[in-house]
């Protein structure tokens, strides 16, 4: 009877997720593996987050849209385990903008869901950021390392989002 | 006072080629991004090429891509365009001008006064 | 690539009257409180001269008669009371994304 409940309550909080998400991916975790954390399908998950990486050539402004029309925002990376996890997806011949931003030049960077910016947990490339007119970052692949950049805002770029994982 | 002044404009034969160079004084020229915007006898202003102020990122439209090259020489204080393969759609005042960002976008400060590019047989 | 649209095409005012000037976006151009627009002004024979940047903003030496609003895709340029040298072409321009467009003109002539 219990796991009887439990599982019509599952089916119907898949059925309303399914308006934002036509498919998930839902894997069982907890102590007793009863609690299923599920991330939309092709999003990749690590820890408690789930992403997407769009290869849609967009401006940072709008690539921040996009993440967020899927319920997400553009990637805030929190530790080196998470930024490692991330970068494993990704094309070495390419910039993808984060969710970090300085839009008064006063190199006053901060992440688009609020979380602070601590300097101790940066990953700037060597010598950057560098000009006050390049007011969002991206990762990209340098001196055989993943690490930011301050780019132009408006020049198109491939994005990450990130969004909560779903627990059903 | 700032100043931009375009020069090297003029008439050429279909399929020529010109350059223009914009002159920059009263400003930190090397500091700043810069555009060359044109406008057609008795049309809108249309775009025409970006350049960062370290010259790391150039950027053009489509109508004119592969046959204009935007560059600057910051010792010189100067912009220039190189212009290939001409068309009479080329014809058109020649503005450069100069970008001050502004949020997450770029505006136009200060324009020269325009060199006038005519292309015909 | 961003279409601006501005209307009306001309507008034919006498001194003294208000102008309003419109420029509509095929998608927005603001950014949470910031609104990427801005507007010019051209006089025969010469170069564009910035009025206003980030929808609101009077750039420096600019009369006070000009201000501007809007958010989103809906800009408008005011002109609260013409005055002869006011007659001229408008024009507004977004930088959000590359391409910078601008907008086709809105011409202000006496009536």
């Known amino acids: 009877n219990f796991m009887y409940s439990k599982t019509v309550k599952r089916l119907s909080k898949l059925q309303e997720y399914q308006q934002y998400y036509p498919s998930l991916t839902c894997v069982m975790e907890g102590k007793d593996m009863e609690d299923w954390s599920c991330c939309p399908t092709p999003w990749t998950s690590f820890q408690s987050s789930c992403y997407f990486i769009s290869t849609v050539m967009q401006s940072w402004t709008k690539s921040q849209n996009n993440c967020s029309v899927m319920g997400a925002d553009l990637v805030v990376i929190n530790t080196k385990e998470e930024q490692d996890f991330i970068t494993q997806n990704l094309k070495i011949n390419s910039a993808y903008f984060l969710g970090l931003s300085d839009p008064k030049g006063w190199r006053h960077w901060q992440w688009v869901d609020q979380t602070p910016y601590n300097k101790n947990v940066t990953f700037w490339h060597s010598g950057e950021p560098n000009s006050p007119d390049e007011r969002c970052a991206i990762i990209n692949f340098r001196s055989e390392e993943w690490g930011w950049n301050d780019v132009h805002c408006h020049v198109p770029q491939k994005s990450i989002c990130k969004m909560k994982k779903i627990y059903i | 006072e700032v100043q931009l002044v375009e020069s090297g404009g003029g008439l050429v034969k279909p399929g020529g080629s010109l350059r223009l160079s914009c002159a920059a004084s009263g400003f930190t020229f090397s500091s700043y991004g810069m555009s060359w915007v044109r406008q057609a006898p008795g049309k809108g202003l249309e775009w025409v090429s970006t350049?960062?102020?370290?010259?790391?990122?150039?950027y053009y439209p489509d109508s004119v891509k592969g046959r204009f090259t935007i560059s600057r020489d910051n010792a010189k204080n100067s912009l220039y365009l190189q212009m290939n393969s001409l068309r009479a759609e080329d014809t058109a005042v020649y503005y450069c001008?100069?970008?001050?960002?502004?949020?997450?976008?770029?505006?136009?400060?200060?324009w020269g006064q325009g060199t006038t590019v005519t292309v015909s047989s | 690539e961003i279409v601006l649209t501005q209307s009306p095409a001309t507008l034919s005012l006498s001194p003294g009257e208000r102008a309003t000037l419109s420029c509509r976006a095929s998608?927005?151009?603001?950014?949470?409180?910031?609104?990427?627009m801005h507007w010019y002004q051209q006089k025969p024979g010469q170069a564009p001269r910035l009025l206003i940047y980030g929808a609101s903003n009077l750039e420096s030496g600019i009369p006070a008669r000009f201000s501007g609003s809007g958010s989103e895709t809906d800009f408008t340029l005011t002109i609260s009371r013409l005055e002869p040298e006011d007659f001229a072409v408008y024009f507004c321009?977004?930088?959000?994304?590359?391409?910078?467009?601008f907008g086709g003109g809105t011409k202000v002539e006496i009536k």
């Open positions: 001008a100069r970008q001050i960002y502004y949020d997450y976008a770029y505006y136009f400060d200060f």
């Open positions: 350049i960062s102020s370290g010259d790391s990122y150039t």
């Open positions: 321009q977004q930088s959000i994304e590359d391409p910078p467009t």
């Open positions: 998608e927005s151009v603001s950014f949470r409180t910031s609104h990427l």
